[in-house]
Interface confidence: medium
Amino acid sequence: MAVTACQGLGFVVSLIGIAGIIAATCMDQWSTQDLYNNPVTAVFNYQGLWRSCVRESSGFTECRGYFTLLGLPAMLQAVRALMIVGIVLGAIGLLVSIFALKCIRIGSMEDSAKANMTLTSGIMFIVSGLCAIAGVSVFANMLVTNFWMSTANMYTGMGGMVQTVQTRYTFGAALFVGWVAGGLTLIGGVMMCIACRGLAPEETNYKAVSYHASGHSVAYKPGGFKASTGFGSNTKNKKIYDGGARTEDEVQSYPSKHDYV
């Protein structure tokens, strides 16, 4: 009973975590304009992984996609890749874990097979969570570095003269969503791995670990990893990235081209 509960809870926690990772990846507020020295600014800038937005004091909002891959900073590309890898691994993990759930009967599937699948999904959730946490942390580090650089530039100029105030960016809501979501996915993965131990005898567990440790890297990496790094496969982002027409749910989840309408 405790095993079923642990497995079920692990699945639910991971599901919430992966939903959060997807939400964070799609959010526009990865970095937001720091208003410390400019609290009554006429425009408010914020940026996501896929586009940047400006909100006017009138409430009119304009978002414009980054319409080039080659011209984007390598760090941004890396963060995109990490988040997408995290989503893909998490999605595959969810699929595997559904069949692994003890409360779901599929034919005459043995507990040892369910244990193997539980462990596989658990490892995938852990890696997925780590990818998300790494992606968000890389972006946050990039922001911190740029923030203090632009702060220094604000007060030190040619011959001591104060330069024009630059727009400085600070942590956006997406970063916190990403950290929490990554953490939840990681916790869910750990719970799945713990549940795996109670699903089969010790000997089976040992075999499952040794087989899947190698089996994961051999069986999943070529298909899952490579497929996930092609941005084209992420239709939601591709639509926005290509601009032009947007599906209804995309327009709702993204403010719009003008983040001041």
Epitope: R51, V54, E56, F60, T61, G71, G243, A245, H258, V261
Partner: antibody, heavy 119, light 112 residues
Framework: QVQLQQSGPVLVKPGASVKMSCKAS????????MNWVKQSHGKSLEWIGI????????SYNQKFRGKATLTVDKSSNTAYMDLNSLTSEDSAVYYC????????????WGQGTSLTVSS | DVVMTQIPFSLPVSLGDQASISCRSS???????????LHWYLQKPGQSPKLLIY???DRFSGVPDRFSGSKSGTDFTLKISRVEAEDLGVYFC?????????FGSGTKLEIK
């Protein structure tokens, strides 16, 4: 093909109001922004405002706030502009122009609606 | 508001000549996403404006390759390599980086 069909010329008396229309065809109406632009006789172009037909978001040029009101009817793919308290200064040709999210430019324009305010 | 200063007001040219129209913005037109939303339009007598060039140098569909755009800081230039009769009219530059969007005063291209 993309077409923006505007309503015909209007002659009104000072102090009156007018509503002009711009019917869009040949594209998905809610996927593009609609701008309104004023061109006084022999003068340059002045941007009045922009409307997001999807969510109803609007931004006006401060100069035209209170003068112009932008609306849309999504069911008929038509954008409207109301102009109130008209004076001779408002006599001009008014254009609607679609704006593409990729280019940020007004890529297709209506033929214009000529407004004459005269007593 | 961003002021777009266009020169010259009038540009007399001979057919087949090269024409160059300048437009200067009062502030940077580089959007926070890195794009520069400066566009060129041609308005022929009795017609509505038509988009020629968007984002400084991208030709709109159907626009001949004799039209090209370039930038240097806040100075923008539209070049017509070989002027044809159908190119005559008033050319406007416009920016959509900052609201309110603004237009240049126009340059009238006419036959010498």
């Amino acid at each position: 093909q993309v077409q923006l069909q505007q309503s015909g010329p209007v002659l009104v008396k000072p102090g009156a109001s007018v509503k002009m229309s711009c019917k869009a065809s040949g594209y998905t109406f809610t996927d593009y922004y609609m701008n309104w632009v004023k061109q006084s006789h022999g003068k340059s172009l002045e941007w009045i405002g922009i409307f997001n037909p999807y969510n109803g978001g609007i931004s006006y040029n401060q100069k035209f706030r209170g003068k112009a009101t932008l609306t849309v009817d999504k069911s008929s793919n038509t954008a409207y502009m109301d102009l109130n308290s008209l004076t001779s200064e408002d006599s001009a040709v008014y254009y609607c122009a679609r704006e593409d999210g990729n280019s940020g430019a007004m890529d297709y324009w209506g033929q214009g609606t000529s407004l004459t305010v005269s007593s | 508001d961003v002021v777009m200063t266009q020169i010259p007001f009038s540009l007399p040219v001979s057919l087949g000549d090269q024409a160059s129209i300048s437009c200067r913005s009062s502030q940077s037109l580089v959007h926070s996403n890195g794009n520069t939303y400066l566009h060129w339009y041609l308005q022929k007598p009795g017609q509505s404006p038509k988009l020629l060039i968007y984002k400084v140098s991208d030709r709109f569909s159907g626009v001949p390759d004799r039209f090209s755009g370039s930038k240097s800081g806040t100075d923008f230039t539209l070049k017509i390599s070989r002027v044809e009769a159908e190119d005559l009219g008033v050319y406007f530059c416009s920016q959509t980086t900052h609201a309110p969007f603004t237009f240049g005063s126009g340059t009238k291209l006419e036959i010498k």
